[in-house]
Interface confidence: medium
């Protein structure tokens, strides 16, 4: 038994050109997590099923906000180490898939978003025991920098975690060939190998290839319980009348293992043994692949034929996801131009342009004094998204279709008086003043 | 923790109708699409309906028109009626939920439907 851990040091843009946008925006904050997922490194015909050696979630890391202009940098990570706890031998070779998601903080309806930013993955050889190896992945446009390695849990010891240290009362020497344990233990064990099959529970070995029963087991691989006297179960309270222990309920009545796992029962409880693709306690848990029809509103599903390898959704427009689960607001993008209003209809967007503007998108603009006139000789101005008239002297109005009063606003200055002519107006000066308007 | 435990189940004769229901525990509705699967002896399981967040529903071609999804988000219930029954639908029906955030599918233990001729 033993435990992988993983340290996830940096996750960000990767070097060279195309560097991604930051994940996050001022108007969506967002905070990153981590997933691990490990397999014992076989060859591809006999693959076991996902994350048989054991997955982990990180917590979430610090909410980060993008600074408008600044350059994406590292992005803030969860404190921690991402821990998956091995209770068999350690492989010694070993599937990894490590992916990185973003928890948006928005305002949505139902609580935050994720959404799968980063999948890396990579086969390693990892003794058990030894320091902690570096890597550094590619996905895109990130880049992933981790730290790895895997460790023995007291008593276990070895590359693989098999062999079991006990510290002894009395000191010995190591004979040849044999080191101690730890330094601080000193029994000098070669590494141990029960007999095959031999009841991880309920048996043990002090010699390589024995299997030795714990007490209430028996049968060469300690698999069958000892019956008391001439009863047939071990289990249950005992019978008032004949002292024999009545059979009770087990932990494997009714089979609690899902999807065809078959059921052992341990000390404590019970174990399944899940058959491929199948996984959890109660082997309740499978991958998904396009055949469980993954993306939603009518995204096209590529590739995941089985439950080892990813699948792609490709969404239709409107919508976006790892899954297509989230309807993109497109008005967002401010697609109608020159001032026009953006409805988006969900099958398709349309603009409501201003006046003077046309075009599926307002990019048209009109022009403004295409068929209108403006009458008694003035002339149409365009501009604004509407057309205007610069009439002539004596006329005004939109279309410059009404006769104006010249002397109405009183034109003529310290007390001159205004007279009407076909060609504008007059002002006759009082004594001591001059000039058209008798402003001198 | 997810579980799913179905109910409903039983034997019937063909042209009548079951309803199955599934009690799902752990299950957040907006991260995943609750679904029916069934798988009939010697024979690989196949989606029979999807219920997706925000109400879409999917249907196998063999049960359209005749089999209904619904979600009850407050009794955290997944139901499916199943009417005019033919005997090709003796299955075992499995409760599903198909989760993105995790990638992950969680099963239910199933309940076995037998339709007879």
């Known amino acids: 038994a033993g435990v992988f851990e993983l340290q996830i040091h940096s996750f960000g843009p990767g070097p060279g050109p195309g560097a991604p946008r930051s994940p996050c925006s001022a108007r969506l904050p967002c905070r990153l997590f981590f997933r691990v997922c490990l397999k014992p490194g076989l060859s591809e015909e006999a693959a076991e099923s996902p994350c048989a050696l054991g997955a982990a979630l990180s917590a979430r890391g610090p909410v980060y906000t993008e600074q408008p202009g600044a350059p994406a940098p590292d992005l803030p990570l969860p404190d921690g180490l991402l821990q998956v706890p091995f209770r068999d031998a350690w492989p010694g070779t070993f599937s990894f898939i490590i992916e990185t998601w973003r928890e948006e903080l928005g305002d949505q309806i139902g609580g935050p978003a994720w959404s799968l930013l980063a999948r890396v993955a990579g086969r390693r050889r990892l003794a058990a025991g030894g320091p902690w190896a570096r890597d550094i992945q590619r996905a895109g446009a990130w880049e992933l920098r981790f730290s790895y390695r895997a460790r023995c849990e007291p008593p276990a010891v070895g590359t693989a975690c098999t062999r079991l240290c006990r510290p002894r009362s009395a000191p010995s020497r190591c004979g040849p060939g044999l080191r101690p344990c730890a330094p601080l233990e000193d029994e000098c064990e070669a590494p141990l190998v029960c007999r095959a099959g031999c009841s991880p529970e309920h048996g043990f070995c002090e010699q390589p290839g024995e299997c030795r029963c714990l007490e209430g087991w028996t049968g060469p691989l300690c698999t069958v319980p000892v019956s008391t006297s001439s009863c047939l179960s071990p289990r249950g309270p005992s019978s008032a009348t004949t002292g024999c222990l009545v059979p009770g309920p087990g932990p494997c009545d009714g089979n609690p293992c899902a999807n065809g796992g078959s059921c052992s029962e341990t000390p404590r409880s019970f174990e399944c043994t899940c058959p491929r693709g199948f996984y959890g306690l109660r082997c309740e848990v499978s991958g998904v692949t396009c055949a469980d029809g993954p993306c939603f509103n009518g995204g096209l599903c590529v590739g995941g034929a089985d439950p080892d390898s990813a699948y792609i959704c490709h969404c239709p427009p409107g919508f976006q996801g790892s899954n297509c689960e989230k309807r993109v607001d497109r008005c967002s993008l401010q697609p109608c131009r020159n001032g026009g209003l953006c409805l988006d209809l969900g099958h398709a967007l349309r603009c409501r342009c201003r006046a003077g503007f046309a075009g599926p998108r307002c990019e048209h603009d009109l022009d403004d004094c295409a068929g209108r006139a403006c009458a008694n000789g003035g002339t149409c101005v365009e501009g604004g998204g509407a057309h205007r008239c610069s009439c002539a002297l004596g006329f005004g109005g939109r279309d410059c279709r009404e006769r104006a009063d010249p002397c109405a606003a009183r034109p003529c200055a310290h007390g001159g008086r205004c007279y009407a002519h076909f060609s504008g107006l007059v002002c006759a000066c009082a004594p001591g003043y001059m000039g058209a308007r008798c402003e001198f | 923790q997810v579980q799913l435990k179905e109910s409903g189940g039983g034997s019937i004769q063909a042209g009548g109708s079951l309803r199955l229901s599934c009690a799902a525990s752990?299950?957040?509705?907006?991260?995943?699409?609750m679904g029916w699967y069934r798988q009939a002896p010697g024979k690989g399981r196949e989606l029979v309906s999807r219920?997706?967040?925000?109400?879409?529903?999917y249907y196998a071609d063999s049960v359209k028109g005749r089999f209904t999804v619904s979600q009850d988000n407050a009794k955290n219930t997944v139901s499916l009626q199943m009417n005019s029954l033919k005997p090709e639908d003796t299955a075992m029906y499995y409760c599903?939920?198909?989760?993105?955030?995790?990638?992950?599918?969680?099963w239910g233990q199933g309940t076995q439907v037998t339709v007879s001729s």
């Open positions: 752990g299950v957040s509705y907006n991260r995943c699409s």
């Open positions: 599903n939920a198909l989760c993105w955030r995790e990638n992950v599918n969680y």
């Open positions: 219920i997706q967040p925000g109400g879409n529903t």
